[in-house]
Structure formats: C-alpha cells, structure tokens
C-alpha cells in the first residue's frame, strides 16, 4: 500500500502518532465509531507527556478518551493494559456514580476541565480525540 509518512490534513503529529480534535460533541460510542471511520481510535494516553500534549490542545473542555469499563474492568480501546499503564484520575474517581438520574452508573472516561480524568455517563455528548499511529497508518489492510 501507499506509505504515509505524515499525518492527514487537519491532524496534528506528535511522537509518531497523529491526533484529531473534535469541535463538537457525540456520545462515547458514536465518537468511537467516528474515529474508526478515520481508521483511528479514541485517544489512548500512555504517559504524562502525552497527557500534557492532549490537554494543551483540548483546553478546559470535557473530552472523551478511549477508556471505558462497559464490560466490567477498565479497558483501553487499543488493548493497552490499564492496570499497569498511565492514569490521571481526579481524586475519588472513578466512582461509577448512580446519582445522576439517567439510569446506570458511569462507564466512560473523559478529560475534565483541568485535564484530570473522570468517569461519566457514556451518552453525554462530549468532544473527543482520535489517535492513529503513523507506522500503522502507513500499512494498507489486505483486500478480502
């Protein structure tokens, strides 16, 4: 397939990954699908340095990331191990709060206004960040 040595138009390159920052909101699952249609995934934060980069670009706005516990344990959408990986939760979070009155708890993680993470109702229409790795982006999938 054709080699991609740089990020697509309107994406930002950082440390061999490409990032796209939405300016409108969708529910977590719809944001996840959006990223998939871009051959990407919701952002997976693996270091404090990456956290600061994303935080700089999103500003003080609730923004979905690729972390959820809809099936039980917390999982990153790309398979990165949650237990041993980077975390940046707000104090007392995640709390799977049921008091919002919307039914169920809180199963999807987002950046809050100070950049630290919170779990929230997955249906809330927050902004989101897509990420794709440059090496991965340069490989065409085989034709079926």
């Amino acid at each position: 397939g054709s080699e991609r040595t740089c990020c697509p138009v309107n994406w930002v390159e950082h440390e061999r990954s490409c990032y796209w920052f939405s300016r409108s909101g969708k529910a977590w699952a719809d944001a996840d699908n959006y990223c998939r249609l871009e051959d990407a995934h919701l952002v997976v934060v693996t270091s404090w340095e990456e956290q600061k980069f994303v935080q700089h670009h999103i500003g003080p706005v609730n923004t979905w990331m690729g972390l959820h516990d809809q099936n039980g344990p917390w999982k990153w959408v790309d398979g990165t191990d949650y237990e041993t990986g980077f975390k940046n939760w707000r104090p007392e979070q995640p709390d799977d709060w049921y008091g919002h009155g919307l039914g169920g708890g809180e199963d999807c993680a987002h950046f809050t206004d100070d950049g630290r993470w919170n779990d929230d109702v997955c249906q809330r229409p927050y902004r989101w960040v897509c990420e794709t790795e440059l090496d991965k982006a340069s490989q065409e999938p085989p034709l079926l």
């Epitope: 397939g1 138009v9 409108s24 998939r36 249609l37 065409e140 999938p141």
Partner: antibody, heavy 118, light 107 residues
Framework: EVQLLESGGGLEQPGGSLRLSCAAS????????MNWVRQAPGKGLEWVSV????????FYADSVKGRFTISRDNSKNTLFLQMNSLRAEDTAVYFC???????????WGQGTMVTVSS | DIQMTQSPSSVSASVGDRVTITCRAS??????LAWYQQKPGKAPKLLIY???SLQSGVPSRFSGSGSGTDFILTISSLQPEDFAFYHC?????????FGPGTKVDIN
C-alpha cells in the same frame, strides 16, 4: 472534477447475488470513508453501509447485515458492494457517496438500479 | 436507531414564496443534521450540514436552523429550480438515518 460512477446493477432472482462497483475520480480516494445508500422506488433514502478510508472498519444497516459486504480497492479508486441472498425488498437504486468529516455525504454517484424479482 | 420525521410530506408553493420544512429526531442529535435536495431520477445534493452550515456552491436562499431534536430548512425565496424533494439526515449515530422526504411542488 470529483466524480463517482456506479455500475453492476441489474435484474436478479431472490436468493441471488450481485456485485456493485463505484469508480471514483478527482479526489484522494483512500483519504475518505465511502458509503452505499439506496432508494426503493417511490421511497426515501436508506443508508446501507460505510467503509473507512483504508478499509479497516465497516458498518452495516441491520437490514443487510450478514448478506452484504462492503469493500474497496484503493489502488484502483474503486468501492464495491457484494450483495448475497437478495430479497425483493432490496430492489432499489443504489448510490455510492463520499463521507465528509461531518458524517454527511457531499458527493454522490448517479446510481445503479437493482431489481430483485422472480 | 434514531428515527427521523419530516413535515409536511408535501408543500405547494409559488416562485418567490418562503418555504419552511421541519425535521424531527427521535432523540437529541445536537447539531449533527444535514439537508439534501433531490430531483426526479437524480442523486441527492448536499445543501446544509451541521444543522446550519451552507455547503459550498449552494445559494444563500437556503438556510438551516435548530439543534437537539427539532430542525428547520428554509428557502427564503423559492426559485423555479427549487421544486424538488428535500431529505434530512442525522449524522450523530450509525446507522445514519434519513427523513421520509418532503416534496416541494408548484402551486
């Protein structure tokens, strides 16, 4: 000029198969997700399927899931829709359409007619 | 799935008239809505995206408004070439869904 041109439609019996093609020109084909949308005679528009730009992700309407397969050949700027186990209710004009970043369809082909009848 | 409804299903109008078409979503889609024009035997044409943004090349007499569940397409002064079908589409969630369409014909 940005263009999409569908082909492959025709008359097929229930249970049969057809493969639709959509030839794209005038834009960087591999950079855009592509869709199939259909319109039964005298009816509204129905979204059928979408495939990501590099082909790694696909989604389908429930009405065609398990019967239709969307695919693409970026080296030939061509989108496909493999239609198996055809039913009378699949009779429609099938359009291919280019997706924008707003999840809408800014370029459409002229359509190809699929008729499923015994 | 998100259901889309449109009203009226048809409207008769004259050249120069102001025409409004309403689209309603079965759940909140914020501003993820598009409008298309379709003439008989032709493909749809994108008019409005993101509820109110005018697609490049579309005349300014077309405008869109609304958010959440209720949206409006307005044609400020109907022209002869505007007699057609108009479809709304929600772009919030897969499966993408369309309204049943509104026919604008000559009074």
């Amino acid at each position: 000029e940005v263009q999409l041109l569908e082909s492959g439609g025709g008359l097929e019996q229930p249970g049969g198969s057809l493969r639709l093609s959509c030839a794209a020109s005038g834009f960087t084909f591999s950079s855009f997700a592509m869709n199939w949308v259909r319109q039964a005679p005298g009816k509204g528009l129905e979204w059928v399927s979408v495939i990501s730009g590099r082909g790694g992700n696909t989604f389908y309407a429930d009405s065609v899931k398990g019967r239709f397969t969307i695919s693409r050949d970026n080296s030939k700027n061509t989108l496909f829709l493999q239609m198996n186990s055809l039913r009378a209710e699949d009779t429609a004009v099938y359009f291919c359409a280019k997706r924008t970043g707003d999840d809408v369809f800014d370029v459409w082909g002229q359509g190809t007619m699929v008729t499923v009848s015994s | 799935d998100i259901q889309m409804t449109q009203s009226p299903s048809s409207v008769s109008a004259s050249v120069g008239d102001r025409v409004t078409i309403t689209c309603r979503a079965s759940q909140d889609i914020t501003s993820w809505l598009a409008w298309y024009q379709q003439k008989p035997g032709k493909a749809p044409k994108l008019l409005i995206y993101a509820a109110s943004s005018l697609q490049s090349g579309v005349p300014s007499r077309f405008s869109g408004s609304g958010s959440g569940t209720d949206f409006i397409l307005t044609i400020s002064s109907l022209q002869p070439e505007d007699f057609a079908f108009y479809h709304c589409q929600q772009a919030n969630s897969i499966p993408f869904t369309f309204g049943p369409g509104t026919k604008v014909d000559i009074n």
